[in-house]
Amino acid sequence: RGVFRREAHKSEIAHRYNDLGEQHFKGLVLIAFSQYLQKCSYDEHAKLVQEVTDFAKTCVADESAANCDKSLHTLFGDKLCAIPNLRENYGELADCCTKQEPERNECFLQHKDDNPSLPPFERPEAEAMCTSFKENPTTFMGHYLHEVARRHPYFYAPELLYYAEQYNEILTQCCAEADKESCLTPKLDGVKEKALVSSVRQRMKCSSMQKFGERAFKAWAVARLSQTFPNADFAEITKLATDLTKVNKECCHGDLLECADDRAELAKYMCENQATISSKLQTCCDKPLLKKAHCLSEVEHDTMPADLPAIAADFVEDQEVCKNYAEAKDVFLGTFLYEYSRRHPDYSVSLLLRLAKKYEATLEKCCAEANPPACYGTVLAEFQPLVEEPKNLVKTNCDLYEKLGEYGFQNAILVRYTQKAPQVSTPTLVEAARNLGRVGTKCCTLPEDQRLPCVEDYLSAILNRVCLLHEKTPVSEHVTKCCSGSLVERRPCFSALTVDETYVPKEFKAETFTFHSDICTLPEKEKQIKKQTALAELVKHKPKATAEQLKTVMDDFAQFLDTCCKAADKDTCFSTEGPNLVTRCKDALA
């Protein structure tokens, strides 16, 4: 049913080089290598990319040339396995090189590290950045692709090319300004924030694909596309979902050239078939390729058809419900998901999938009974609690965010999640709480009908990262329980967790709460992380501390930092007032 060309090519690498063009080809190969071998330097990867590109050009010139008929996995895998000192640098990943394709590629994929021990990607000073950008824009952008890809091994490759293009445009504009710093900082911060969200969203898609297969991803795509394109018919939505599934499967599987090529093909198809898809695509379709595909991926929802019948007519009142379900289960459930989703752009995809799952379970049970209509007749009413739960979550959390602001809201979440899973490492809890807390800024300011999909689908993506990090070193039964279930049930599972009663509180260690004057010169973000680390440790020491007790301690702590950082002799202030603070904390929590 898909839109993609299927003709065979004598040389796959020549075909992709021709389709993508040299610039995108090189960028994608660099991303692929950086995502597979995350410790290698830019120069090492750049050398390999140049060799692969030179080889691709020989195949373009003559598709029958030696090795041009080999698969991309074979060609890329052979390149990676030829790297000197592979075992010394990558340990057991080197064992992948003893395998044949496709097992070798599977092995490389299994060794991708979601949390590589790399230093944070630091942004150079504006002047320095502009100098190196002007000297060699290609190398500068290559470094950007390499640094992002190695830290985010599942980043959606064609979308990373888009962010690199954004980066390039910002630098071109700002490096010509007198005040480069004030031009660059807000713009690059904006790109960074969007890219980080893109990364966790894509990781969630790959998790869905890896853990639950293509069918689960396709269901996600049907719901999402139906919300965005409510005037497209089911056949059109199914075709788009099938193609989107293929694109994502390729990217998640490391087939980045195919993924980018197929994504471009899908964008082309959508723009050529706007009449049957959506009235909102034209603005996107006027843009060049990378911007077009990005724009289509977040295009506004089309206006819902005015004359849609009530959902009950087809899925509850129709006398042939069980006959339809028995005859073509997947298509019938897919139609239900389509019809429900196109009527509810105000629901999260996770919620829509939970409703479809509930509907399926109801039909499984009821269609086996003597009087099915009497049994499934109340199914839509049974959806109500499933809908109310996330609506209440949004209201409660957005109210709290509006009251506390982002930093205070992050702290509230940090306390909550440390109580739910105190065994989880403090850095992981702080990272998770900071990310979860950003949902307020990102979603709570949106119009009412956009809040729920924004909040829940973002939280689900962040919690997916929590699960991935926890999988590496499982320490909490609570987390294991929530992460073992289906993807769509994770967020409700985490929300329902309460204080872990099995946890033995941590001993109070004074050094955990001992601070030095160097904290005063840290950027605000780093200061916050230090304070949040202390907060998590306090909760681990006293999991049942009241909100009031914790507030008292944190206010005291903030006052202490403020006083000592303003003192003439900071070091003396920290060394004398620090122990007093620790004593007051212990007393307040006693």
Partner: nanobody, 123 residues
Framework: QVQLVESGGKLVQAGGSLRLSCAAS????????MGWFRQAPGKEREFVAG????????YYSDSVKGRFTISRDNAKNTVYLQMNSLKPEDTAVYYC????????????????WGQGTQVTVSS
């Protein structure tokens, strides 16, 4: 209101093929399930094939499954019935019908009907 006009019926040899068309006008075509029914002399009108609302699913009676194919073109507001390996017992007046139900088979669920087109299969 939906108006339906069938065409393409004629006399054909057993084993031959035929394609019937049904052009719709009036309301939004994709909002309707489209069905083909047939009525042989002295018999009840029977369901042959359906294309679910919103082009969601194609379904057939057991007697034509594997031989007939229903398809639709929403841009042209037309539904087709491709009939292969025709048999003398396929002789009937073929009617096109439209319904707001999802995947209807029962003739009573179809609110709009065409005038019919005659298909005769000779042995």
């Amino acid at each position: 209101q939906v108006q339906l006009v069938e065409s393409g019926g004629k006399l054909v040899q057993a084993g031959g093929s035929l394609r019937l068309s049904c052009a719709a006008s009036g309301r939004t075509f994709s909002n309707y399930a489209m069905g083909w029914f047939r009525q042989a002399p002295g018999k009840e009108r029977e369901f042959v094939a359906g294309s679910g609302r919103s082009n969601s699913y194609n379904y057939y009676s057991d007697s034509v499954k594997g031989r007939f194919t229903i398809s639709r073109d929403n841009a042209k507001n037309t539904v087709y019935l491709q009939m292969n390996s025709l048999k003398p017992e396929d002789t009937a007046v073929y009617y096109c019908a439209a319904s707001t139900n999802l995947w209807p088979r029962d003739r009573n669920l179809y609110a709009y009907w065409g005038q019919g087109t005659q298909v005769t299969v000779s042995s």
